[in-house]
């Protein structure tokens, strides 16, 4: 069964800067990744970035740099200044559209006890399934 994992960490150098990493554990080819915050995309969440494996990457503030880390994982750095900056309990969600599995989404937030710059190893987060 495909899974999506989400890892959130606060940067030690900039305490209001976050890095979100998401990955897809499945055999299908990924056609699109959507990263949002404040809840799942389409359910109150606000889109931060949309990544297509070949067409390119679109991102919006406070996202600073979205990129593919591997063919099945992405990372997103968020700026930490201004009214739209994230806070420690912000929820981040990643939605992977894959063929033939469908669409898979998971959410995560900063671990409550985590020190800046430290985070638990990425583990599969609760998975929401919405077939394409």
């Amino acid at each position: 069964t495909p899974e999506v994992w989400v890892q959130v960490r606060m940067e030690a150098t900039e305490l209001s800067s976050f890095t979100i990493r998401c990955g897809f554990l499945g055999s299908g080819s990924i056609s699109l990744v959507t990263v949002s915050w404040g809840g799942p995309n389409g359910a109150g969440g606000t889109t931060l970035a949309v990544l297509h494996p070949e067409r390119g990457i679109r991102q919006w503030a406070p996202a600073r740099q979205a990129r593919w880390e591997t063919q099945s994982s992405i990372s997103l750095i968020l700026e930490g200044s201004g009214a739209s900056s994230p806070c420690a309990n912000t929820t981040f969600c990643c939605k992977f559209a894959s063929f033939p599995e469908g669409s898979w989404e998971a959410c995560g937030s900063l671990p409550p006890s985590s020190d800046p710059g430290l985070s638990a190893p990425p583990t599969p987060a609760p998975i929401l399934r919405a077939d394409l």
């Epitope: 606000t46 679109r58 919006w60």
Partner: antibody
């Protein structure tokens, strides 16, 4: 079928503003950004910026910051580009586009002349 | 900003012959993580909007004839039309799809010899 339909040609005076509309159909309007690109007569393509209708998040080309405003109305699946303080060199065809420039509107000719 | 430079500025090719357009970017368009090059090619005919031909440097957009092909990596890219048809007369643009702002080449005008 994805379609982007733009408003008609405009003739404007220098110093005035113009608002161009782009009505989308055939896909989920809120999910993908609407890009705006212009092309001066006989010239190449120049990216103005983009708006993501679902959140009204925007990115602007630095060249146009402060002079251009993007808005979107999800209820009608229509995006708008307003360009102010028009000058003669803004005379161009203005295009909207979506899904990484895979789909384009037919273009709107804006002529700035006194 | 990434500067895109096309060559030649204009090109005349006989019907049925091969046409080659080059595009050079001032920075690499390769995403090392997934080894994809974020470069696109467009065709524009007079009075029409641009039409996406190629994305990801080498993937043809749906419905584009297979005589169009894209190649290259990093900073150097090529659009090839294997056998020129009369309807291919147009201006061709390459585009940086790697980073903001998306920037276009100056265009290459393709004509029939």
């Amino acid at each position: 079928e994805v379609q982007l339909v733009q408003s008609g040609a405009e003739v404007k005076k220098p110093g005035s503003s113009v608002k161009v509309s782009c009505k989308a159909s055939g896909y989920t309007f809120s999910s993908f950004s609407i890009e705006w690109v212009r092309q001066a007569p006989g010239q190449g393509l120049e990216w103005i910026g983009e708006i993501l209708p679902g959140s009204n998040s925007t990115n602007y080309n630095e060249k146009f910051k402060g002079r251009v405003t993007f808005t979107a109305d999800e209820s009608t699946s229509t995006a708008y580009m307003e360009l102010s303080s028009l000058r003669s060199e803004d005379t161009a065809v203005y295009y909207c586009s979506s899904y990484w420039f895979a789909y384009w509107g037919q273009g709107t000719l804006v002529t700035v002349s006194s | 900003d990434i500067v895109m430079t096309q060559s030649p500025d204009s090109l005349a090719v006989s019907l049925g012959e091969r046409a080659t357009i080059n595009c050079k970017s001032s920075q690499s368009l390769l995403n090392s993580g997934n080894q994809k090059n974020y470069l696109a090619w467009y065709q524009q005919k007079p009075g029409q909007p641009p039409k996406l031909l190629i994305y990801g440097a080498s993937t043809r957009e749906s419905g584009v004839p297979d005589r169009f092909s894209g190649s290259g990596s990093g900073t150097d890219f090529t659009l090839t039309i294997s056998s020129l048809q009369a309807e291919d007369v147009a201006v061709y643009y390459c585009q940086n799809a790697h980073s903001y702002p998306p920037t276009f080449g100056q265009g290459t005008k393709l004509e029939i010899k």
